[in-house]
C-alpha cells in the first residue's frame, strides 16, 4: 500500500524529512523540489539549505523543524489543490552519487463544508449555481460563490492533519530518515 | 503497489449492451474516485466519467452522456461501466484509471479492455 | 470544453537527438497540463503533471514546460524505447480533454 501524506485545503501540509549529523552542526545540504527526484539535485526547488543556514525558499515552504539536528520537514503553508503531487526530498551527501533521496508524496483535499451532501467534487451537481470546485490545476482557489439561500460555513477540523495525529510520532520510521556518519 | 485490473475483450452485437469491470487493489477504495477512458481503433484518448466509490458521486462527459452507467461495489474494491445501445462507433479499448486524489491527472491505469461491436 | 491541439500528429527523430512536442489549449489552463506515454499495445503512462513536474521512476531526460495555453513536452536525448505516442491533457476543469497525440517515430 502506497505511503501518502494528506492535509486539507486552506491547512498547513507536512512532509517529514530526517536525517542524523554526524556531529552537532555538522550539517548537509538539503533541498527540497517538486516533482519526483532526479539523478541529480531537485527539480523546481522550493527550498535549500546548505552546511549553515536556509539559504533559498520561495513563499510558503518553510522549515519548521529544528534543521540544525536533522530535521528538514517540510511545512507548506495554506495550501490549495494544485499543491497535490510529488515532492522530493534530497540529503546530499557528500561524495559521488551518495545523495539520499526521498520521493514523498501530497495529497490535498477540499476543505470540508456544509450542507455537504456529497464530496466537494461533486458540489457542481449539488448546487448549479456554482462552479465546479474539484481539483483542477493551479488556479483552484475553492470559492463557493454566491448562495444566498444556503449558509455555507468552511469547517477546519483537520489542521495539520498528519502533525496532529497518532503517526505523528511515528514519523521518523517512516522511511525518510537517515543517519549521516 | 496500486493495480487496476480491467475484466477481458468483448464482442458484441449492435444494439446490445456490455458490463466491463476494473478491480483495484493496493489502495484504499474509498478514498479516491476511479476515472473511465476510452480510446477508438487509431485515435486519441476520450474521457468517460468517474464514480466516487464512497458516496456513489458520479460525474459524467456531456457529449457521451446516457452511454455509459458507472457502479461500484466497496466490498469487493470493484468499478463497474456498463455501456448500452452499442453501435460500431462505441467499438474501442476502454481503460479504467486512478487519480492522484482531488486532481485530474492519472498516475494508475487499467490494461485496457477491447470491446468490439459488430454483426 | 476545453480544446487540446497537438500541431504534429507525427515526429521523426534520430537517437540521441533532443525533440519537442507541442500542446496548445483553447483557453488558459494555468499550468494544469500533464503528459502521457503511450506505447503500441498499452496503456498510457504518465510522465509530467502541471506542466513541469515529473511523476516518480520516470526517467529526467522527460521535461514539461509551458503555462497558459501553450506547453512544451521535451526529451533531452532521444532513446529507442522513446518510441510512442505522446498526449497532453488538461488537468484544469472537468471534462479532463486529450491532445490527438503526437507518434515519435525513430529514424
Known amino acids: 500500500s502506497e505511503v501518502e501524506y494528506r492535509a486539507e485545503v486552506g491547512q498547513n501540509a507536512y512532509l517529514p524529512c530526517f536525517y542524523t549529523p554526524a556531529a552537532p552542526g555538522n550539517l548537509v545540504p538539503v533541498c527540497w523540489g517538486k516533482g519526483a527526484c532526479p539523478v541529480f539535485e531537485c527539480g523546481n526547488v522550493v527550498l535549500r539549505t546548505d552546511e549553515r543556514d536556509v539559504n533559498y525558499w520561495t513563499s510558503r515552504y518553510w522549515l519548521n523543524g529544528d534543521f540544525r539536528k536533522g530535521d528538514v520537514s517540510l511545512t507548506i503553508e495554506n495550501v490549495t489543490l494544485a499543491d497535490s503531487g510529488i515532492y522530493c526530498c534530497r540529503i546530499q551527501i557528500p561524495g559521488i552519487m551518495n545523495d539520499e533521496k526521498f520521493n514523498l508524496k501530497l495529497v490535498i483535499k477540499p476543505a470540508k463544508v456544509t450542507p455537504a451532501p456529497t464530496r466537494q467534487r461533486d458540489f457542481t451537481a449539488a448546487f448549479p449555481r456554482m462552479l465546479t470546485t474539484r481539483g483542477h490545476g493551479p488556479a483552484e482557489t475553492q470559492t463557493l460563490g454566491s448562495l444566498p439561500d444556503i449558509n455555507l460555513t468552511q469547517i477546519s477540523t483537520l489542521a495539520n492533519e498528519l502533525r496532529d495525529s497518532r503517526l505523528a510520532n511515528d514519523l521518523r520510521d517512516s522511511g525518510a530518515t537517515i543517519r549521516i556518519g | 503497489e496500486v493495480q487496476l485490473q480491467l475484466s477481458g475483450p468483448e464482442l458484441v452485437k449492435p444494439g446490445a449492451s456490455v458490463k466491463m469491470s476494473c478491480k483495484a487493489s493496493?489502495?484504499?477504495?474509498?478514498?479516491?474516485?476511479m476515472h473511465w477512458m476510452r480510446q477508438k481503433p487509431g485515435q486519441g484518448l476520450e474521457w468517460i466519467g468517474y464514480?466516487?466509490?464512497?458516496?456513489?458521486?458520479?460525474k459524467y462527459n456531456e457529449k457521451i452522456k446516457g452511454k455509459a452507467t458507472l457502479t461500484s461495489d466497496k466490498s469487493s474494491s470493484t468499478a463497474y461501466m456498463e455501456l448500452s445501445s452499442l453501435t460500431s462507433e462505441d467499438s474501442a479499448v476502454y481503460y479504467c484509471?486512478?487519480?492522484?486524489?482531488?486532481?485530474?491527472?492519472?498516475?494508475?491505469w487499467g490494461q485496457g479492455t477491447l470491446v468490439t461491436v459488430s454483426a | 470544453d476545453i480544446v487540446m491541439t497537438q500541431s504534429h500528429k507525427f515526429m521523426s527523430t534520430s537517437v540521441g537527438n533532443r525533440v519537442s512536442i507541442t500542446c496548445k489549449a483553447s483557453?488558459?489552463?494555468?499550468?494544469?497540463v500533464a503528459w502521457y506515454q503511450q506505447k503500441s499495445g498499452q496503456s498510457p503512462k504518465l510522465l509530467i503533471y502541471?506542466?513541469?513536474n515529473r511523476y516518480i521512476g520516470v526517467p529526467d531526460r522527460f521535461t514539461g514546460s509551458g503555462s497558459g495555453t501553450d506547453f512544451t513536452f521535451t526529451i533531452s536525448s532521444v532513446q529507442t524505447e522513446d518510441l510512442a505516442v505522446y498526449y497532453c491533457?488538461?488537468?484544469?476543469?472537468?471534462?479532463?480533454?486529450f491532445g490527438g497525440g503526437t507518434n515519435l517515430e525513430i529514424k
Open positions: 493496493g489502495y484504499t477504495f474509498t478514498n479516491y474516485v
Open positions: 502541471s506542466a513541469s
Open positions: 464514480i466516487d466509490p464512497d458516496n456513489d458521486g458520479i
Open positions: 483557453q488558459d489552463v494555468t499550468t494544469a
Open positions: 491533457q488538461q488537468h484544469y476543469s472537468i471534462p479532463p480533454t
Open positions: 484509471a486512478r487519480d492522484f486524489g482531488y486532481v485530474d491527472w492519472f498516475p494508475y
